[in-house]
């Protein structure tokens, strides 16, 4: 790391080290030999989250309901607003600037992980012995019915999209 001219939480201006403004405040005027750095608190709906020499605070993020967004955590003078998505939707990026509807898992696929406000549904193909016959954002793959436990026999084999069909035992068999 290269050497720095100033202490931590200071900056160099006009060959002199001045104190940075603390989080939640913006720079009004640099220090001089006789005066300290002048800082002012950020206004309503503004923030600065680091020690800084910014002359303008950043605007809080707007969680636009038209994009499916809502406020997860209200911003302060030191933190930005955190947006999340309405129920049934998830963010399209880490910054959560817009939302998309949770994906449904097609027949033959089940839900491995239910979607959250920030991640989409994760689907997995139904393995042998399991099926899903619906398009759903919640349903897991279901196990095929066990005909034997019902004293029945398999009349039609199951697939990844259909359950087995059970029927009565063939009484003519010895």
């Amino acid at each position: 790391e290269p050497p720095t001219a100033c202490r931590e939480k200071q900056y160099l201006i006009n060959s002199q080290c001045c104190s940075l403004c603390q989080p939640g405040q913006k720079l009004v005027s640099d220090c001089t030999e006789f005066t300290e750095t002048e800082c002012l608190p950020c206004g309503e709906s503004e923030f600065l989250d680091t020690w800084n020499r910014e002359t303008h605070c950043h605007q809080h993020k707007y969680c636009d309901p038209n994009l499916g967004l809502r406020v997860q955590q209200k911003g302060t003078s030191e933190t930005d607003t955190i947006c999340t998505c309405e129920e049934g939707w998830h963010c399209t990026s880490e910054a959560c600037e817009s939302c998309v509807l949770h994906r449904s898992c097609s027949p033959g696929f089940g839900v491995k992980q239910i979607a959250t406000g920030v991640s989409d549904t994760i689907c997995e193909p139904c393995p042998v012995g399991f099926f899903s016959n619906v398009s759903s954002a919640f349903e897991k793959c279901h196990p095929w019915t066990s005909c034997e436990t019902k004293d029945l026999v398999v009349q039609q084999a199951g697939t990844n999209k259909t359950d087995v069909v059970c029927g009565p035992q063939d009484r003519l068999r010895a």
Epitope: S19, C31, E33
Partner: antibody, heavy 126, light 107 residues
């Protein structure tokens, strides 16, 4: 009362490393930058760098960049200075020196040393 | 880096004399300057900081003045215990730099 007690004298061969310790007592260790200053025999004072014991942040003089490492152990209020790849011209008395309290200074770096360790003589000789 | 030039490099004086040491910075350092006294085999001792503020416990015969690039340390009436080497140090920006020292010797 404030005291900075340094480790004892060291004799090292060229190319070796040395690690000097500086144990602080009598004040809040984390509240003051600790600097290291050296003085070659019969010569003046040379600033090496500082460590902020609170954050662990460091700042080294360009001359020592890549060769010096300053660390601290706040649990025992001790600062360390390690110098690698020693040369004969590194023979000097090494001092730790306490800075003004953090937050004392708003303009300038205001690094004035009100307390010093007793010094550690490091001799580099083959 | 800011260069600090001290003069003279040595001065011979008698007890009771007024001694003046100067320090010049290669660029303006406002009032961010300190003066130290060092005796043989000992660590330096802070005398003055921010160019003119006397460190607690330092006798009032020591005084400092100046700002910008030119600074002065004055010992108004030299005492036997004042025979030592004196260093100036700029505290405006890192890297901190010291003057080459002024040795005050007995005439």
């Amino acid at each position: 009362q404030v005291q900075l007690v340094q480790s004892g004298a060291e004799v090292k061969k060229p190319g070796a490393s040395v690690k000097v310790s500086c144990k602080a007592s009598g004040y809040a260790f984390a509240g003051f930058y600790m600097h290291w200053v050296r003085q070659a025999p019969g010569q003046g004072l040379e600033w090496m760098g500082w460590i902020n014991p609170d954050s662990g942040g460091t700042n080294y003089a360009q001359k020592f960049q890549g060769r010096v490492t300053m660390t601290r152990d706040t649990s025992i209020s001790t600062a360390y200075m390690e110098l690698n790849r020693l040369r004969s011209d590194d023979t000097a008395v090494y001092y730790c020196a306490r800075d003004q309290p953090l937050g004392y200074c708003t303009n300038g770096v205001c690094s004035y040393f009100d307390y010093w360790g007793q010094g550690t003589l490091v001799t580099v000789s083959s | 880096d800011i260069q600090m030039t001290q003069s003279p490099s040595s001065v011979s004086a008698s007890v009771g004399d007024r001694v003046t040491i100067t320090c010049r910075a290669s660029q303006g350092i406002y009032s961010w300057l300190a003066w130290y006294q060092q005796k043989p085999g000992k660590a330096p001792n802070l005398l003055i900081y921010t160019a003119s503020t006397l460190q607690s416990g330092v006798p009032s015969r020591f005084s400092g003045s100046g700002s910008g690039t030119d600074f002065t340390l004055t010992i108004s009436s030299l005492q036997p215990e004042d025979f030592a080497t004196y260093y100036c140090q700029q505290a405006n920006i890192f890297p901190l730099t010291f003057g080459g020292g002024t040795k005050v010797e007995i005439k």
